[in-house]
Interface confidence: low
């Protein structure tokens, strides 16, 4: 009686179980009563990453330098190429199809989370008592100078973009 299901790494065709092609190889012809499944290795720029019955291998991903991409890991006949972003850029999505520059946090904003290859700089507004006077992809909001600890007084209040200005205390004669 012909089988209705096949073992792992086999597939059912014409009422018989044929072996699947191993990763890195594509199907050329199905097995018959007398012959084994015929498989061929994928070419240099192609891959198949599973046991399969595909008649075509998949093209390796192209890491397009115009999109800010470079090869992180070269593909093999069994694995796809992995792209990553050039220095100073991060992926626009999980699939990393193109890259954008890490953004800088403007004055008045500090870095909450530094950018990585896959996520952008996250900025936060400087709260009261903190400031940032630079546009930076690295600097956090800095606390206002404490004039008291230097035996000075505040001559000019700080803002989210400027530090306080300290000055000498008026001496009472």
């Amino acid at each position: 009686e012909p089988p209705t299901a096949c073992r792992e790494k086999q597939y059912l065709i014409n009422s018989q179980c044929c072996s699947l092609c191993q990763p890195g190889q594509k199907l050329v012809s199905d097995c018959t009563e007398f012959t084994e499944t015929e498989c061929l290795p994928c070419s240099e720029s192609e891959f198949l990453d599973t046991w399969n019955r595909e008649t075509r291998c998949h093209q390796h991903k192209y890491c397009d330098p115009n999109l800010g991409l470079r090869v992180q890991q070269k593909g093999t006949s069994e694995t796809d190429t992995i792209c990553t972003c050039e220095e100073g850029l991060h992926c626009m999505s999980e699939s990393c199809e193109s890259c954008v520059p890490h953004r800088s946090c403007l004055p008045g904003f500090g870095v909450k989370q530094i950018a990585t290859g896959v996520s952008d700089t996250i900025c936060e507004p400087c709260p009261v008592g903190f400031f940032s006077n630079v546009s930076s992809a690295f600097e956090k909001c800095r606390p206002w100078t404490s004039c008291e600890t230097k035996d000075l007084v505040v001559q000019q209040a700080g803002t989210n973009k400027t530090d306080v200005v300290c000055g000498p205390q008026d001496r009472q004669r």
Partner: antibody, heavy 120, light 107 residues
Framework: QVQLVQSGAEVKKPGASVKVSCKAS????????VNWVRQAPGQRLEWMGL????????TYNQKFKGRVTLTIDKSASTAYMELSSLRSEDTAVYYC?????????????WGQGTLVTVSS | EIVMTQSPATLSVSPGERATLSCKAS??????VAWYQQKPGQAPRLLIY???DRRTGIPARFSGSGSGTEFTLTISSLQSEDFAVYYC?????????FGQGTKVEIK
């Protein structure tokens, strides 16, 4: 204050194409992704795609692939969305949206919208 | 694609009351969710990004929470200007997808 100013309303016949522009004031687009989102009457917002002004790289919603083209003119700080082979169900308000401080996908700044009506 | 489902479709609330809006993702989107407010004839306005970070200039009565597949937008004390439609957006993977919206109306 960042502003995105879009081109005016359009009326098109089925099968035609429409090109909507989106001009940024105050800052250059470079480094900030520009998303395009549409909203048919009474419907949810629908993301169409985005363009990376830094590289010109685009990512499209497969639903629109082949019909939508996003481009950018960095020197004019203007982004464009062209939709071809228009059908009646493309009648919608089309928005451009850009991110400034927060995150490249969660757009902070939006254009006022451009109504595109497709009717024979 | 990831489907974002918002509930309820309509929420009737009195001014000064608390409103809780829910958004569920069909798969894990980590904390990559944003919330938008939209009033008739206007473009959407970003309120919350990365699930819980309030955009600069947004009043403290708006707060976001959640991660993975379940997210919440809370408006602690509704003001007259808060009556609008609210959308969640997942920005974890392409295509970016919005929920169908929750209309917050005056009770």
């Amino acid at each position: 204050q960042v502003q995105l100013v879009q081109s005016g309303a359009e009326v098109k016949k089925p099968g035609a194409s429409v090109k909507v522009s989106c001009k940024a004031s105050v800052y250059s687009f470079t480094g900030y992704t520009v998303n395009w989102v549409r909203q048919a009457p009474g419907q949810r917002l629908e993301w169409m795609g985005l363009i990376n002004p830094y590289t010109g790289g685009t990512t499209y919603n497969q639903k629109f692939k082949g019909r939508v083209t996003l481009t950018i003119d960095k020197s004019a700080s203007t982004a464009y969305m062209e939709l071809s082979s228009l059908r009646s169900e493309d009648t919608a308000v089309y928005y451009c949206a850009s991110s400034y401080y927060s995150n490249p996908y969660a757009s902070d700044y939006w254009g006022q919208g451009t109504l595109v009506t497709v009717s024979s | 694609e990831i489907v974002m489902t918002q509930s309820p479709a309509t929420l009737s609330v009195s001014p000064g009351e608390r409103a809780t809006l829910s958004c569920k993702a069909s798969q894990n989107v980590h904390t990559r969710v944003a919330w938008y407010q939209q009033k008739p004839g206007q473009a959407p306005r970003l309120l919350i990004y990365l699930a819980s970070d309030r955009r600069t200039g947004i009043p403290a009565r708006f707060s976001g929470s959640g991660s993975g597949t379940e997210f919440t937008l809370t408006i602690s004390s509704l003001q007259s200007e808060d009556f609008a439609v609210y959308y969640c957006l997942q920005h974890w993977t392409y295509p970016l997808t919005f929920g169908q919206g929750t209309k917050v109306e005056i009770k």
